[in-house]
């Protein structure tokens, strides 16, 4: 299920291909599209242009991150008079043009979404031949990828003075709340580190001092679900080592 949020500044228009030419280039994209990790999403993009009945060569491009400078994730080219836009680039084979650029539609389908796909995307069209012109969306469309929590790492590490601490790292969107439970802990939120720079979907919770042997469970939960993982601490009494 894909939700598309549309605001008044860039409303989606269906542009009739043979209408009189527009005054200027314009691109219509929604501010945001939301979809769940693992699913597919459609990034809508339609445009108007000032060139009457253009049927020369064209290239459709989508890039991620920022306009102009961001890396291309999809590119296709259509020959003069052709309605077929031949794919030249589809990053990891997951991007596919749904729209028909000849009918002013550059809408893109993204398959098998991952949290790393959560970023802004910019559509661009280039005309070549007699008319040489190009245009790229200025604000782009934000692809918001949601995901149920997944614990990516749980571990026990030595601390100074023969103590031990536990770390739990989980990913999800919205970022999950983490809680530790274990011997003499009850249910503890522990010390939760805010998402790290460049790792916006990762959250880490630390149990700074494990005082009892036994099973420690980390639970990650957000509005889409929960996940848990456990780690066991068993210290050899009288020795400085521990088994986990």
């Amino acid at each position: 299920f894909v939700r598309t949020k549309i605001d008044t500044t860039e409303n989606l228009l269906n542009t009739e291909v043979h209408s009189s030419p527009a005054q200027r280039w314009s691109m219509q994209v929604p501010p945001e599209v939301s979809a769940e990790a693992g699913d597919a999403a459609v990034l809508p993009c339609t445009f108007t242009h000032p060139h009457r009945h253009y049927d020369g060569p064209l290239t459709a491009i989508w890039r991620a991150g920022e306009p102009y400078a961001g890396p291309q994730v999809f590119r296709c080219a259509a020959a003069r008079g052709s309605e077929l836009c031949q794919t030249a680039l589809s990053l990891h084979g997951r991007f596919r043009l749904l729209g028909n650029p000849r009918r002013n539609d550059l809408s893109l389908r993204v398959e098998r979404l991952a949290l790393a796909d959560d970023r802004r995307y910019f559509c661009r069209v280039e005309f070549a031949g007699d008319v040489h012109d190009r245009y790229e969306s200025r604000h782009g469309v934000r692809l918001h990828v949601t995901a149920a929590p997944r614990i990516v790492n749980i571990s026990v590490l030595p601390s100074p003075a023969h103590a031990f601490r536990a770390l739990c790292t989980a990913e999800g969107e919205p970022p999950p709340a983490l809680a530790w439970s274990g011997p003499a802990l009850g249910n503890s939120l522990a010390a939760v580190r805010s998402p790290r720079e460049g790792h916006g979907h990762l959250v880490t919770a630390e149990l700074p001092a494990l005082t009892h042997d036994g099973r420690y469970t980390c639970t990650a939960a957000n509005s889409l679900g929960r996940s848990e993982a456990s780690v066991y601490l068993f210290r050899f009494h009288g020795a400085s080592g521990a088994s986990t």
């Epitope: 008044t8 500044t9 200027r24 280039w25 314009s26 040489h132």
Partner: antibody, heavy 118, light 115 residues
């Protein structure tokens, strides 16, 4: 911080030519159109023309056609405006402007004053 | 012919609102325009792109006190909670490709005085 740094003020005699430069930093001029706009003392803005540095294609306002040349050097990220057969009415502040593809002129240089006087 | 008409001046008190009008020539009443601000002794600054339906997209660093609206051939720029730094000329501009010829026209500008 996007910057368009223009060359300094010029004083020219009628009939002469002037060449004004505009150096861009923090962005690649190949990705934009570069426009030139002028403003005579106490007057409004007047569009002169633009260049697409990607392929050096230019568009000029009919009023300036034949008297103006806009060029760009992508290796130095610099745009140039050359205006020939100067007359006193060409006395103005000349602005180079970054043009988003399409029509929006979203970033303006500081301006270069050109004075034409005998 | 593509023409933009603006009234020469407007004034309002500090903290009040002012609404500026830019009128397109009748045969171009559907056109999208751009608004620019020019403070005294400075170069122009891009304020917003304003469409026929009133939707608008503001430039970087433009406060949300600046808004746009449209009615027929008229395009409006409203500045609310007027500040002293808003004292400037406000110029509308319109770019179009007409019969494969690119043109860009500016209005005469409206001088806003903050009382």
């Amino acid at each position: 911080q996007v910057q368009l740094v223009q060359s300094g003020a010029e004083v020219k005699k009628p009939g002469a030519s002037v060449k004004v430069s505009c150096k861009a930093s923090v962005f690649n001029i190949k990705d934009y159109y570069m426009h030139w706009v002028r403003q005579a003392p106490g007057q409004g803005l007047e569009w002169i023309g633009r260049i697409d540095p990607e392929d050096d294609k230019t568009k000029y306002a009919p009023k300036f056609q034949g008297r103006v040349t806009i060029t760009a050097d992508t290796s130095t990220s610099t745009a140039y405006l050359e205006l020939s057969s100067l007359r006193s009415e060409d006395t103005a502040v000349y602005y180079c402007v970054r043009g988003w593809l399409g029509y929006i002129m979203d970033f303006w240089g500081q301006g270069t004053t050109v004075t034409v006087s005998s | 012919q593509l023409v933009l008409t603006q009234s020469p001046s407007a004034s309002a008190s500090l903290g009040a609102s002012v609404k500026l009008t830019c009128t397109l020539s009748s045969q171009h009443s559907t056109y999208t325009i751009d608004w620019y601000q020019q403070q005294p002794e400075k170069g122009p600054r891009y304020v917003m792109e304003l469409k026929e339906d009133g939707s608008h997209s503001t430039g970087d660093g433009i406060p949300d006190r600046f808004s746009g609206s449209s009615s027929g051939a008229e395009r409006y720029l409203t500045i609310s909670s007027l500040q002293s730094e808003d004292e400037a000329d406000y110029i509308c501009g319109v770019g179009a490709t007409i019969k494969e010829q690119f043109v860009y026209v500016f209005g005469g500008g409206t001088k806003v005085t903050v009382l």
